[in-house]
Interface confidence: low
């Protein structure tokens, strides 16, 4: 149980105030984290509050400004990148967002040796992606879907690809679906460890159907946004991987890396690339039916100037109960012998654990085990492996950092974070310097977040990097809600939930209940993290109880729970929310005539289906940017969990799981449907179809659209959205304004 201390005695209560909606919309109680920008084993860069770029040396304790805020301001730079030889800095300005990760920008190169910007052979604009080589100061960049290389910043560029074309061929950057659903990056190029080779992906979207939507803007005529976007079952991008020698790029040109035969026999994806050495690379591939993944280790053949991927270096990962991996297939972390590696995948009991692969996957040595899951491998050194898991005290919504000593026999395991600040910190991530000489720990809660610096050998805390003192002081006179994390055991299923309770919560009274749901495959909502957000306000000021429940399909509790939703999205996720609500009613403090549910994206889909479940449990609910039919969503994501919408595969469940099919069932609930018209991710089409079905069924409902807003509904739309939803809920719960 996690109870946030109220921090005061009753005598002080008259000086305390509840959270207001304005507090939330203004970000009054937002927190800061500190992630060092590591540049060596003992040095890191950080952008100071006054915008100077400062280099810190942990061992000498010295710091100095390498780039002044004056230089940054001279080109309106919002970001920077130091070349590994420390001779140049790129300055990024004119940031222009595209999709979730992608953006374009203007780049200037500043020469630190003479204190001037590099003139001559300036970079074109806007650039889609730019990065330094890992050694020296070579530059690779993507401009108009083609890749260019500079040996030095002032040199003329060498053009590597020539076939790049908007919305057709993408070189070195992903198309929409690879960016959002596979790579989760804005880039698709990778330097070898010493910068000898550059690997890149080419995505051919020529045959992909295009989603088109209006962007209204301010002009007389709206413009049309066209995105090659493969929906479930549609034609997918065709991917190829190339590698070029950057020392002599014109010598043989880009060489294609062969696709494993068992993958190439049908539609497939490329999922990630990991360099092992300058002349060894590891590629991961995935069948379109995403239950088979192949990891292929390829070697450079000097004599032929080609890349060879022997079958003996192909490692197959297959799931017989669901899809391969968790949300993504995990990536390998190679050991110092440059052939064996560590990787997280399901063990025989169906829990994701770290395995060590030396020759074949069948002979893998299991490194961690138990009825919990290893979540991320941060770093492998010669003698230690650092990873995160949710093992400690059997709370799946926690994250602690562990060290396994692999240099000694038998290997010993130590929890680095479990007892550091036990009440305040139960959810950590980490960032390691070269060779793990030092590391930063970033604690996200449940108390106020704190970032600290540690010695990589002894784990001793060296200093606090950020402790959010201002936030702590600002919260001293705020009546925060109480939070508890507990579990329900129902029919051999464990349902973890987080309940957010009003500050003066009294179990003998009755409270309106709001369920906040996401519920997507491999997600987790019940986490021991700090947040002061909209639902905190609803509990603090409006006296609501808010609950979040992790049901079937959610992550980090084993494959049985995770893969329960395989090929049947929209069934068990909804059932488990309903089951939890019934259990909450049994607790005695919920007013069963005032229960609502709300969610965004996948959560909008689940909330819509829950409202249309015909149970009579919910008085009202909100769906923000919901999926309404899996036929409308992206192939890579949808097919991972649902298979194909064909008669000989899973078309029947695609049809049965739509929100539209349940239009009649909305008759007895108050439904608020919200969507941005320029949503590139979950297309406005989804809500348009719900609205049409409700109109055709003559069912009353409320709706709000946000013109030219995407899936995030950002800026002023955010304020409008939360104000609108607050009014809707207060009306539903008969709370006075």
């Amino acid at each position: 149980i996690v109870l946030r201390p109220s921090r005061v005695h009753n005598s002080e209560e008259n000086t305390m105030r509840a959270l207001t909606l304005k507090d939330i919309l203004n970000g009054t109680f937002s927190y800061k984290t500190f992630f060092p920008n590591w540049i060596s084993g003992q040095e890191y860069l950080h952008q100071s509050a006054d915008n100077n770029i400062v280099l810190y040396n942990i061992e000498t304790g010295q710091s100095y400004t390498i780039l002044s805020n004056r230089t940054m301001k001279s080109v309106n730079a919002s970001n920077y990148g130091l070349s590994p030889d420390r001779q140049f800095v790129y300055l990024e300005s004119d940031y222009s967002k595209l999709w979730r990760y992608s953006y374009t920008a203007t780049y200037y190169i500043y020469d630190l040796s003479n204190g001037e910007f590099v003139r001559g052979n300036e970079l074109p604009r806007p650039i889609q992606y730019l990065c330094w080589s890992p050694v020296g100061s070579k530059l690779a960049y993507v401009y108009q879907n083609n890749i260019y290389l500079k040996q030095r910043p002032g040199d003329p560029p060498f053009q590597i690809t020539f076939n790049g074309r908007e919305n057709k061929i993408f070189n070195g950057i992903p198309d929409w679906v690879y960016e959002e659903e596979m790579l989760a990056t804005k880039y698709a190029l990778w330097w070898s460890p010493n910068g000898k080779f550059l690997a890149y992906a080419e995505f051919n979207d020529t045959d992909i159907p295009v989603i088109a939507y209006s962007y209204y803007g301010d002009e007389q005529y709206p413009r049309t946004i066209n995105i090659p976007y493969p929906k479930a079952g549609a034609k997918n991008p065709v991917v190829r991987i190339f590698i070029i020698d950057t020392t002599y790029p014109a010598y043989v040109g880009p060489q294609e890396v062969p696709v494993p035969a068992m993958i190439a026999s049908s539609d497939y994806y490329f999922s990630w690339l990991t360099w092992v050495t300058d002349e060894r690379v590891c590629l991961q591939w995935l069948k379109r039916v995403q239950n088979v993944s192949v990891l292929s280790i390829c070697d450079f053949r000097e004599d032929w100037q080609t890349w060879d991927c022997p079958k003996t270096q192909e490692h197959i990962e297959e799931s017989r109960t669901g899809w391969a991996g968790g949300f993504f297939v995990s990536t390998p972390v190679f050991s110092y012998d440059a052939i064996s590696y560590y990787k997280i995948f399901s063990d025989k009991d169906g829990y994701k654990h770290i395995h060590y692969i030396k020759d074949t996957v069948e002979n893998a040595i299991q490194i961690t085990s138990g009825k919990w899951e290893a979540i991320n491998i941060f770093r492998v050194t010669q003698d230690s492996l650092f990873y995160s898991s949710n093992e400690f005290e059997e709370y799946p919504g926690r994250r602690n950092i562990y060290r396994i000593s692999i240099g000694s026999y038998p290997p010993s395991k130590k929890c680095v974070t479990c007892h550091l600040r036990k009440e305040r910190c139960q959810y950590y991530t980490a960032s390691f310097s070269d060779y793990a000489k030092y590391y930063a720990l970033v604690c996200y809660g449940p108390g106020i977040p704190i970032s600290t610096l540690h010695d990589g050998r002894t784990d001793q805390e060296i200093k606090i990097l950020e402790e959010n003192k201002e936030l702590e002081n600002a919260l001293k006179n705020i009546q925060l809600p109480k939070e508890e994390i507990k579990k329900l055991e129902v029919d051999e299923i464990t349902l973890w939930y987080k309940m957010i309770l009003p500050p003066q919560f009294d179990r003998s009274k009755k409270y309106p209940l709001l369920i906040q749901v996401y519920g997507g495959p491999c997600s987790q909502s019940v986490r021991s993290v700090f947040a002061v957000n909209w639902i905190s306000y609803l509990a603090s000021k409006e006296g609501m109880v808010i609950a979040l429940v992790d049901g079937r399909g959610t992550a980090f509790q084993g494959d049985k729970l995770l893969y329960a939703v395989y090929r049947k999205l929209g069934v068990y996720e909804v059932e488990d929310q309903i089951t939890a609500v019934r259990k909450f009613i049994e607790m005695g403090f919920i007013d069963e005539k005032r229960i609502a549910i709300w969610g965004w994206s996948y959560g909008g889909y689940v909330s819509s289906l829950a409202l249309a479940s015909g149970t009579g449990l919910f008085k009202c609910g909100i769906a923000v940017a919901p999926v309404s039919s899996w036929e409308y969503y992206a192939s890579v994501y949808t097919e991972r969990f649902m298979g194909l919408p064909t008669k000989d595969d899973n078309l029947e469940h695609y049809k049965n799981s739509t929100v539209m099919a349940r239009a009649e069932y909305f008759r007895n609930v108050d439904y608020l449907l919200i969507h941005g018209t320029a949503d590139d991710n979950v297309h406005f089409q989804n809500s348009a179809q719900i609205a049409k079905a409700l109109v055709n069924a003559q069912v009353d409902f409320q709706a709000m659209w946000y013109s030219d807003q995407n899936h995030g509904l950002s800026g002023l739309s955010t304020n409008h959205l939360y104000t609108h939803m607050t009014h809707f809920l207060k009306q539903c719960f008969s709370l006075s304004d």
């Epitope: 989603i211 088109a212 929906k231 079952g233 549609a234 036929e631 064909t646 078309l651």
Partner: nanobody, 118 residues
């Protein structure tokens, strides 16, 4: 019985135009994605235009983009292919097709011949 019937083919000079029509019966055409394919002698079947159920999304390969336009009238259960600036290499039998998802076309018409020649 699902039926697709094409019409509008014929002989046309290079640079000329033709409008092909496809009448659908036996199913609710708005349910399906519709496409126009062509097959030249000795060659495989090639998709030249596709349109989503509502007509909101269309697709053309590079070879016809800007010259061909696909449209549909769900009320009349018709799909059209407007072909402008025709070239000799556009000579083929043109087929109308319907499918339950993109690129899975399970219903086909008998085809209509288009010949571009001077």
């Amino acid at each position: 019985e699902v039926q697709l019937v094409e019409s509008g083919g014929g002989l046309v000079q290079p640079g000329g135009s033709l409008r092909l029509s496809c009448a659908a019966s036996g199913f609710i055409s708005s349910y399906y994605y519709m496409g126009w394919f062509r097959q030249a002698p000795g060659k495989g079947r090639e998709l030249v235009a596709a349109i989503s159920r509502t007509g909101g999304s269309t697709y053309y390969p590079d070879s016809v983009e800007g010259r061909f336009t696909i449209s549909r009238d769900n009320a009349k259960r018709m799909v059209y292919l407007q072909m402008n600036s025709l070239r000799a290499e556009d000579t083929a039998v043109y087929y109308c097709a319907a499918g339950d998802i993109n690129y899975h076309y399970n219903y086909w018409g008998q085809g209509t011949q288009v010949t571009v020649s001077s």
